[in-house]
């Protein structure tokens, strides 16, 4: 039995997979911030997790996926205000009783040190210093990501 959050995540991911392939992104569009091989868009409004997921999809992107602790730290370094929380693309899968990224993979327990409970309707947010489990209905900001296509001798936009 999948929760409504899980269904929403699966539906959006499937619809993204059906869309026509676009040419690779060589540098970040205006208003997006480059972090290594990704372009990030930090929202300036707030939404529950599933609305944030949908918003990223309309922007032909996804909620942020964090590969490892190093990427987490680099992302957190971009957050100026200690008090602001941002949704990322990780929520609790009730059926698998585990944290699951929106791309279908499970969280490696060593990657993130999550503060809070792993339970139904829990989604993950990050702040400048920490990673939190929050009710998915909580209205906070979010981070969308686009992957850059690696090219040699790339000129990076302003940082």
């Amino acid at each position: 039995q999948k929760s409504s959050i899980e269904k929403c995540s699966v539906d959006i991911q499937q619809s993204r997979n059906k869309t026509t392939e676009r040419p690779g992104l060589l540098n970040c569009p205006i208003y997006w911030q480059q972090l290594r091989e990704k372009c990030l868009l930090f929202s300036h409004t707030v939404n529950p997790w599933n609305n944030s997921l949908a918003d990223c999809s309309t922007k032909e992107s996804s909620l942020l996926l964090i590969r490892d602790k190093d990427e987490l730290i680099h992302t957190q370094n971009l957050i100026r205000d200690k008090a602001i929380l941002f949704w990322i693309g990780l929520n609790f899968s009730l059926s698998e009783k585990n944290w699951k990224w929106i791309n279908g993979s499970f969280l490696n327990s060593n990657d993130l040190e999550i503060r809070g409970d792993a339970k139904e309707n829990s989604c993950i947010s990050i702040s400048q210093t920490s990673v939190y489990s929050e009710y998915c209905s909580t209205e906070i900001r979010w981070i969308c990501q686009k992957e850059l296509t690696p090219v040699r001798n790339k000129v990076y936009p302003d940082s």
């Epitope: 208003y31 300036h44 309309t58 922007k59 971009l78 602001i84 302003d158």
Partner: antibody, heavy 116, light 111 residues
Framework: QVQLQESGPGLVKPSETLSLTCTVS????????WSWIRQPPGRGLEWIGY???????NYNPSLKSRVTISLDTSKNQFSLKLNSVTAADTAVYYC??????????WGQGTLVTVSS | DIVMTQTPLSSPVTLGQPASISCRSS???????????LSWLQQRPGQPPRLLIY???NRFSGVPDRFSGSGAGTDFTLKISRVEAEDVGVYYC????????FGQGTRLEIK
């Protein structure tokens, strides 16, 4: 209601640095993009650059080598520095809030004249 | 750079009559996020610009409904259904698909 107010010297000597500050009231600077735009007397508008609330910047390529925009969240201000100015930099300088391509709130503008 | 070209550069209009301003971009304004960041600004004499329309057709808060925007791709139009005396000024289109650029402006004046 968000309000923006530019401040800084109205006269700058050639080759010196133009420095302006924009103070934001009625809303927090810890959101959105914050832009500088200029308008030479009797002419059209030119975008100078923006700073995002997380501190990253993007500049007009034609001015990029001379421009720095910075942010002070504690004072709810953002600033423009344009170095090595010439008479061609004489303009009314505006600050504005940028909602991803929609400049929705503007300051009244401040005229900066470059002259010796 | 994306070049924005407005026509006409000057538009004398009779009060109560409609007015239309065209804006053409040198390339498509569809951003890689799927949105089209084309806005229209009004600058009355001696005042800063004021946002009228954003993302082609969305009226900004407080803007009278006689102002409307339309278009797609590279061709965009601002329409004023019935011109009023307070509409006098210069109108600019602006794109933000890449770094923002403005049209050269269209001066609206009363006949």
């Amino acid at each position: 209601q968000v309000q923006l107010q530019e401040s800084g010297p109205g006269l700058v000597k050639p080759s010196e640095t133009l420095s302006l500050t924009c103070t934001v009231s009625g809303g927090s600077i810890s959101s959105y993009y914050w832009s500088w735009i200029r308008q030479p007397p009797g002419r059209g508008l030119e975008w100078i650059g923006y700073i995002y609330y997380i501190g990253s910047t993007n500049y007009n390529p034609s001015l990029k080598s001379r421009v720095t925009i910075s942010l002070d969240t504690s004072k709810n201000q953002f600033s423009l520095k344009l170095n090595s100015v010439t008479a061609a930099d004489t303009a009314v300088y505006y600050c504005a809030r940028d909602m991803m391509g929609a400049l929705d709130y503007w300051g009244q503008g401040t005229l900066v004249t470059v002259s010796s | 750079d994306i070049v924005m070209t407005q026509t006409p550069l000057s538009s004398p209009v009779t009060l109560g009559q409609p007015a239309s301003i065209s804006c053409r971009s040198s390339e498509s304004l569809v951003h890689s996020d799927g949105n089209t960041y084309l806005s229209w600004l009004q600058q009355r004499p001696g005042q800063p610009p004021r946002l009228l329309i954003y993302k082609i057709s969305n009226r900004f808060s407080g803007v009278p409904d006689r102002f409307s925007g339309s278009g797609a791709g590279t061709d965009f139009t601002l329409k004023i259904s019935r011109v009023e005396a307070e509409d006098v000024g210069v109108y600019y289109c602006m794109q933000a698909a890449q770094f923002p650029t403005f049209g050269q402006g269209t001066r609206l004046e009363i006949k």
